[in-house]
């Protein structure tokens, strides 16, 4: 058993049929010595008396809010949560496996630039009685500070018969130099509590590996005289690291109709303009990627050909 | 310890081409190592990230763009002295700071070159003959060093009398290639910045 936060404790259980469970001793936080009784949750049934209560925790029915009282007055609470371990593996029931970029990916993180600011998100099908707490650091043995905000519900989607909820959190490394060469990864730890179930999820990454620029901005078209070609130009996104001559981007320019199966014109360039062939009912799209370290491409920025 | 903006005309910067070739060569070599050594811990997640130039050079700080010198997190630089007679810029206006930056890059390359050559000598003794260093990568390191054209004492190639541990050597190769790729990215950014200034 260990303390998650004040008056909240996590009991780690090997989860298999007829498992013996864990013996837990609760102590009432009071100077009083006599006349103390214990109850669980909303029940008025007295579980025991005395300053300490010893319980055998085997299943979720044994978890919950234990309260010690004296003469009708509440003295203190202890909330017990369960963390299940099945076949040596901690349970991952609360969050959905996003399977990208690989299996068992529960947390996904992205950064728009090298400033040390990043966003992580996760998915769940659970809608109520759900809380998250996020901590982060650079390195684990001698951790350097990363400050994370509160996790918030950022999107709701319908997937078949199920509703899916996306939560996200923003974090900022306390003293980040955009030009630095990372040797210690960022560690992100998410504590998830659903009713009386506790789970924790972690992700470890270098900012350079989670870079995904915003799409290029200000796409403009200029038809070329006596030609089917148009010159398309754009600018670096405002959120990208500066100076741009140091943090350079490369671009992919594509002309395509509505269907992915349609024919297309595609060209890659390090410049902020390109010449392509425009077709009726097609659109020109441009996306960006770090020129020197190939992490993710940005989403497309698009304009119609006409 | 930063780069001033008064740098040479675009076109006057032969190092940019060499640094692009360097990044390409080390990226290809790293990809080859990851494929060939698929049963070794050779991915970014599996290896320890070591920097053989740590406390010996300070390329990131010495080559910091002017715009980032306002960022205090970028300025915890280690003082290191460098040789200052680089010719990469082909310009009389080469500033002291820029020479410091370029000589730091040169020292990085020299240290990696020695490490890679020592390692290759060991890998050539491996009866499995599983992986060797790409001669193109070694040649590209040499070309960029020549373009930087700094005079410095030659570092003797380390020779080891004991029987090499090929497993350890291959893991060390992965560590070295990952670190060198990150440094090659920095070098490319620096050259691009200097070329544009």
């Amino acid at each position: 058993i260990w303390e998650l936060k004040k008056d909240v404790y996590v009991v780690e259980l090997d989860w298999y049929p007829d498992a013996p469970g864990e013996m837990v001793v609760l102590t009432c936080d009071t100077p009083e010595e006599d006349g103390i009784t214990w109850t669980l949750d909303q029940s008025s049934e007295v579980l025991g008396s005395g300053k300490t209560l010893t319980i055998q925790v085997k299943e979720f029915g044994d978890a919950g809010q234990y309260t010690c009282h004296k003469g009708g007055e509440v003295l203190s609470h202890s909330l017990l949560l369960l963390h299940k371990k099945e076949d040596g593996i901690w349970s991952t029931d609360i969050l959905k496996d996003q399977k990208e970029p690989k299996n068992k990916t529960f947390l996904r993180c992205e950064a728009k630039n090298y400033s040390g600011r990043f966003t992580c998100w996760w998915l769940t099908t659970i809608s109520t009685d759900l809380t998250f707490s996020v901590k982060s650091s650079r390195g684990s043995s001698d951790p350097q500070g990363v400050t994370c905000g509160a996790a918030t519900l950022s999107a709701e989607r319908v997937r078949g018969d199920n509703k899916e909820y996306e939560y996200s959190v923003e974090c900022q490394e306390d003293s980040a130099c955009p030009a630095a060469e990372e040797s210690l990864p960022i560690e992100v730890m998410v504590d998830a509590v659903h009713k009386l179930k506790y789970e924790n999820y972690t992700s470890s990454f270098f900012i350079r590996d989670i870079i995904k620029p915003d799409p290029p901005k200000n796409l403009q078209l200029k038809p070329l005289k006596n030609s089917r070609q148009v010159e398309v130009s754009w600018e670096y996104p405002d959120t990208w690291s500066t100076p741009h001559s140091y943090f350079s981007l490369t671009f992919c320019v594509q002309v395509q109709g509505k269907s992915k199966r349609e024919k297309k014109d595609r060209v890659f360039t390090d410049k902020t303009s390109a010449t392509v062939i425009c077709r009726k009912n097609a659109s020109i799209s441009v996306r960006a990627q770090d020129r020197y370290y190939s992490s993710s491409w940005s989403e497309w920025a698009s304009v119609p050909c006409s | 310890r930063n780069l001033p903006v008064a740098t040479p005309d675009p076109g006057m910067f032969p190092c940019l081409h060499h640094s692009q070739n360097l990044l390409r060569a080390v990226s290809n070599m790293l990809q080859k190592a990851r494929q060939t050594l698929e049963f070794y811990p050779c991915t970014s997640e599996e290896i320890d990230h070591e920097d053989i130039t740590k406390d010996k050079t300070s390329t990131v700080e010495a080559c910091l763009p002017l715009e980032l010198t306002k960022n205090e997190s970028c300025l915890n630089s280690r003082e290191t002295s460098f040789i200052t007679n680089g010719s990469c810029l082909a310009s009389r206006k080469t500033s002291f700071m820029m020479a410091l930056c370029l000589s730091s890059i040169y020292e990085d390359l020299k240290m990696y070159q020695v490490e890679f050559k020592t390692m290759n000598a060991k890998l050539l003794m491996d009866p499995k003959r599983q992986i060797f260093l790409d001669q193109n990568m070694l040649a590209v390191i040499d070309e960029l060093m020549q373009a930087l054209n700094f005079n410095s004492e030659t570092v003797p190639q380390k020779s080891s009398l004991e029987e090499p541990d090929f497993y350890k050597t291959k893991i060390k190769l992965c560590i070295l290639l990952h670190a060198f790729r990150i440094r090659a990215v920095t070098i490319d950014r620096v050259m691009s910045y200097l070329n544009a200034s």
Epitope: Q229, K263, D265, R266, F268 | -
Partner: antibody, heavy 118, light 107 residues
Framework: QVQLVQSGAEVKKPGSSVKVSCKAS????????LHWVRQAPGQGLEWMGW????????EYAPKFQGRVTITADESTSTAYMELSSLRSEDTAVYMC???????????WGQGTLVTVSS | DIVMTQSPLSLPVTPGEPASISCRAS??????LHWYQQKPGQQARLLIA???QSISGVPSRFSGSGSGTDFTLTISSLQPEDFATYYC?????????FGQGTKVEIK
């Protein structure tokens, strides 16, 4: 399976024209750009131009502008390349090639030898 | 027009050995470069698109690298069926242009 089958070899007199055909099978004809590339004996490849069979849009290499015409007949899934004012240096194997991507070629025809000789 | 220069023009190789062909562009073309194989009397065949993207059905011994002005096609271990002429082609701008070709022959 996608195939491009070209018409047979031709012998032409200088100053005349030649029209080479390229019939496509497999896949929808108008879903691909169609290009013409030539190869003179012992020489490399030389791009001549492309057509979008869907709308008849064409683009030609400046070297051939005014002398080459590329057309397409959707009903027969056939593209044509006509080269006029032939000279001896136009002796070459003419190949059609296609792709959904405009700027490179994933399927090629077998080639048609055009000999220009007096 | 962008001029593409291949080297060497002829490359004698022992079967089973690796082979590398270089292609240089007269100006920067990013990764807009493609490689083809041509055998006498046969259709040309696309091997690599956009400098390094492998093509379905092409053996994994063919790989491409490069960007900007310098590109390489590598055949890791030459098989008897690989003896042919190889061309690079730029797609950065029209007119599309090819290298002169490299003939890989049996040593």
């Amino acid at each position: 399976q996608v195939q491009l089958v070209q018409s047979g070899a031709e012998v032409k007199k200088p100053g005349s024209s030649v029209k080479v055909s390229c019939k496509a099978s497999g896949g929808t004809f108008s879903d691909y750009y169609l290009h013409w590339v030539r190869q003179a004996p012992g020489q490399g490849l030389e791009w001549m131009g492309w057509i979008d069979p869907e709308n008849g849009d064409t683009e030609y290499a400046p070297k051939f502008q005014g002398r080459v015409t590329i057309t397409a007949d959707e009903s027969t899934s056939t593209a044509y390349m006509e080269l006029s004012s032939l000279r001896s240096e136009d002796t070459a194997v003419y190949m059609c090639a296609r792709n959904k991507e405009l700027r490179y070629f994933d399927v090629w025809g077998q080639g048609t030898l055009v000999t220009v000789s007096s | 027009d962008i001029v593409m220069t291949q080297s060497p023009l002829s490359l004698p190789v022992t079967p089973g050995e690796p082979a590398s062909i270089s292609c240089r562009a007269s100006q920067s073309i990013s990764i807009n470069l493609h490689w083809y194989q041509q055998k006498p009397g046969q259709q040309a065949r696309l091997l690599i698109a956009f400098a390094s993207q492998s093509i379905s059905g092409v053996p994994s011994r063919f790989s491409g690298s490069g960007s900007g002005t310098d590109f390489t096609l590598t055949i890791s271990s030459l098989q008897p069926e690989d003896f042919a002429t190889y061309y690079c082609q730029q797609s950065n701008s029209f007119p599309l242009t090819f290298g002169q070709g490299t003939k890989v022959e049996i040593k």
